[in-house]
């Protein structure tokens, strides 16, 4: 099931920024999702549940995000122009067991500015 998650559109563009979507199986209840830019952790989101099923979300790097029952989307508004970067979603599954760590989708994002117009953004899987 995890292997199927790479086949989705990882990057989309809006409001001059980049949305990076990291998908995971709907059965996952508690998780950590990390977004790597090259080898650097850019975003780190953890979702856990307590004994009363209350959800706790920790976002220590303060990345703008959107969480659904099968994806985490991170929003980047300061992507460097004229410089390509490789982005990778890394998933740790706490629940249900067994504990698993998986590198999910990855893609190369190149942003460059046209002298005539606007930023053009290309991504390669």
């Amino acid at each position: 099931e995890l292997n199927d998650l790479a086949n989705h559109r990882m990057f989309s563009f809006h409001d001059g920024g980049v949305q990076i979507s990291c998908n995971y199986p709907e059965t996952v209840q508690q998780l950590k999702m990390q977004l790597f830019k090259d080898r650097e952790v850019l975003c780190d989101l953890t979702k856990t549940k307590g004994s009363g099923n209350t959800v706790s979300i920790k976002n220590p790097m303060s990345c703008p995000y959107q969480l659904s029952n099968n994806s985490v989307s991170f929003f980047l508004d300061n992507a460097d122009s004229s410089q390509g970067s490789y982005f990778l979603c890394s998933l740790s599954i706490f629940d249900p067991p067994p504990f698993q760590e998986k590198n999910l989708s990855g893609g190369y994002l190149l942003i460059y500015e046209s002298q005539l117009c606007c930023q053009l953004k290309l991504w390669l899987p």
């Epitope: 004994s51 009363g52 099923n53 209350t54 920790k58 706490f94 067991p97």
Partner: antibody, heavy 117, light 111 residues
Framework: EVQLVESGGGLVQPGGSLRLSCAAS????????MDWVRQAPGKGLVWVSN????????EYSPFVKGRFTISRDNAKNTLYLQMNSLRAEDTAVYYC??????????WGQGTLVTVSS | DIVMTQSPDSLAVSLGERATINCKSS??????????LTWYQQKPGQPPKLLIF???TRHTGVPDRFSGSGSGTDFTLTISSLQAEDVAVYYC?????????FGPGTKVDIK
């Protein structure tokens, strides 16, 4: 090896206060929700309170809400339970427990709190 | 609050025989594909120990003579072949919502 060691129990008069502590070791304390569960002598288990990984979420049993306060110090790997306005019915062994994502997977040996005049 | 009930209150079973404990919740504990029900064993003078989570998954190190079953509001803990070291009180517990609650316990003895 996960270890949870409670302290701070004892005899207290009705209306009095006590502060329980739980020293945790053998795991990354700041990665886990933690709970207090109590057991009156010869009786069953009753959940008391919980706290999330950094202390920003706390929940309480209706029996203790407004009287007990749970807190944690992740730098000291310690969980606390401040108990005020104690009543005779609060007499119990208080267990510190780790919420291991889908169950209480580690328990301390417990500390006895006796509320009596 | 969800109320958990257990039956019987106590039972005595011969060594090697099957012991069955029932647990009922006042509302369904099923959410998605998960039943938010756990079982604990408490031996005399000891803290409780996690046996089964999500109604049917054995915790690490728990012998396979222990099994859990059921869904929704009705659950069962079965000890397929009772051993002397299984003498204990067994509690069911839900974590479907707050506050989580325990059943009153079932005491298991040797006949």
């Amino acid at each position: 090896e996960v270890q949870l060691v409670e302290s701070g129990g004892g005899l207290v008069q009705p209306g009095g206060s006590l502060r329980l502590s739980c020293a945790a070791s053998g795991f990354t304390f700041s990665d886990y929700w933690m709970d207090w569960v109590r057991q009156a002598p010869g009786k069953g288990l009753v959940w008391v309170s919980n706290i999330d990984e950094d202390g920003s979420i706390t929940e309480y049993s209706p029996f203790v809400k407004g009287r007990f306060t749970i807190s944690r110090d992740n730098a000291k790997n310690t969980l606390y339970l401040q108990m005020n306005s104690l009543r005779a019915e609060d007499t119990a062994v208080y267990y510190c427990t780790r919420w291991g994502r889908f169950g209480f997977d580690s328990w301390g040996q417990g500390t006895l709190v006796t509320v009596s005049s | 609050d969800i109320v958990m009930t257990q039956s019987p209150d106590s039972l005595a079973v011969s060594l090697g025989e099957r012991a069955t404990i029932n647990c009922k919740s006042s509302q369904s504990l099923l959410s998605g594909s998960f039943n938010y029900l756990t079982w604990y064993q408490q031996k005399p003078g000891q803290p409780p120990k996690l046996l089964i989570f999500y109604a049917s998954t054995r915790h690490t190190g728990v012998p396979d003579r222990f099994s859990g079953s059921g869904s929704g509001t009705d659950f069962t803990l079965t000890i397929s072949s009772l051993q002397a070291e299984d003498v204990a009180v067994y509690y069911c517990h839900h974590h479907y919502n707050a506050p989580p609650t325990f059943g009153p316990g079932t005491k298991v003895d040797i006949k």
